[in-house]
Interface confidence: low
Amino acid sequence: YSNFRKSVDSTGRRQYQVQNGPCSYTFLLPETDSCRSSSSPYMSNAVQRDAPLDYDDSVQRLQVLENILENNTQWLMKLENYIQDNMKKEMVEIQQNVVQNQTAVMIEIGTSLLNQTAAQTRKLTDVEAQVLNQTTRLELQLLQHSISTNKLEKQILDQTSEINKLQNKNSFLEQKVLDMEGKHSEQLQSMKEQKDELQVLVSKQSSVIDELEKKLVTATVNNSLLQKQQHDLMETVNSLLTMMSSPNSKSSVAIRKEEQTTFRDCAEIFKSGLTTSGIYTLTFPNSTEEIKAYCDMDVGGGGWTVIQHREDGSVDFQRTWKEYKEGFGSPLGEYWLGNEFVSQLTGQHRYVLKIQLKDWEGNEAHSLYDHFYLAGEESNYRIHLTGLTGTAGKISSISQPGSDFSTKDSDNDKCICKCSQMLSGGWWFDACGPSNLNGQYYPQKQNTNKFNGIKWYYWKGSGYSLKATTMMIRPADF
């Protein structure tokens, strides 16, 4: 008899048993893939390639291997079916054939099966080796990735540590800044308080200075009057002495003309015998209105009425038309006498104008005009000058013919612009003209390249701001 059965051994391999009479043939076959054609991605006996660099590649190739294994399994199943079919046929033939031939046929079939099985086993071993190789390489890659990850983690930890340190430092510095701000605020508060105290002190001192100035003015005036009274007394005494010593003194009548008590200008004061430079009271022509002026009794024979003086920048000269009309400042320091008074004074008699200038290098110069007068307010106090001599330039730095007077609130210049606003101060601006003695006062080392400074163009050029200026007038026939 003969039969064929299939079973699975303890190792999980398939067993093929052929029972033929007293003889039993057992074949143990591994589950292998079918033979691959040469077009297959991997030849069964090909040398294993280098492991792919990409993880995804490795996965892909593993899937290919799995597919190959699956194909092998399917092929074996087909082979199993084929063997079953053939065995049935051959068993019939064997039964029909002579008993002697059975053994040979069975051996032949067994040999064929063994050869095929051996081949399949070799292929499977190759595949297993490839899979193992791939797995090993993947494990190596994973290990490398793990090492890289560890390094990155360490770097992140280091950076986190640095960030923490920086945050600590930052917190420390912030605290310091806050402390400093606190101290700074305290200091500022203290300084503000000191400033307030100083301002109060300055206010008090200003009041005291004002009082002292008033007292000084009064004292000067009193001194002037005393000088005059002394002069008058001396004249009276001399007159009396002359009368007493005269033989016909009894018949002589002492006639003394009325003493002058008001003065039109400093020249009259000088001629009255008061020859000390200082502040004197002048009276407007044909009026009882008075004005205080500084009289220079020393320069060039004396008798000069000072109409403008700059020396230290203590007085703001960017004033209104009204202020320039009436005068401002202090005759003891910087001041403007007043356009109205000068206009009235120079409109009655012929006056000369002397302008004295000082630069920051210790040089002095002057310009002298032999005829000077100001027109009335209806003509914007237009200036008229002739006959220039002196050391402060051969060309007049006050534009010729004369210009109208302009202030920040009364623009009468020949410029499209507003010269007074642009160049600062009230002046006889042209467009805008070569001079401005009422410009912005600039201290030493800040006095060059200033277009709005105290300028006398034909002596020091346009950008030079002078240290001191004085404008003074005196009758031409003094």
Epitope: P434, Y457, S462
Partner: nanobody
């Protein structure tokens, strides 16, 4: 370094035109007056035209009125002198000068001008 550079001069026939340029470097022209002056051979230097600083008021010598035009372009730091209807008597070396006072006076005297260019020759001849 403060510098003024004139350009645009050359030979031109009577009745022709030229445009002179005065380019400033080292300072901004905004607050400066600029004057054009000329000096013919054997003659004194004379003021031709000036332009004040921010307001742009201009002056012209009687001999060039109606023919010459002065203008300024503060963004280019340059002043121009457009000369039309040129005559042989306009032949001279033309200079530009700047006055940091920003003013111009009636005759563009130029005695106190702070900086001067090297000049450009204008020849009017047939």
């Amino acid at each position: 370094d403060v510098q003024l550079v004139e350009s645009g001069g050359g030979l031109v026939q009577p009745g022709g035109s030229l445009r002179l340029s005065c380019a400033a470097s080292g300072f901004a022209l905004d607050y400066y007056a600029i004057g054009w002056f000329r000096q013919a051979p054997g003659k004194e230097r004379e003021g031709v035209s000036c332009i004040s600083s921010s307001d742009g008021i201009t002056y012209y010598a009687d001999s060039v009125k109606g023919r010459f035009t002065i203008s300024r372009d503060n963004s280019k730091n340059t002043v121009y002198l457009q000369m039309n209807s040129l005559r042989p008597e306009d032949t001279a070396v033309y200079y530009c000068a700047t006055d940091s006072g920003g003013y111009i006076d009636y005759d563009c005297m130029g005695l106190g001008y702070d900086y001067w260019g090297q000049g450009t020759l204008v020849t009017v001849s047939s």
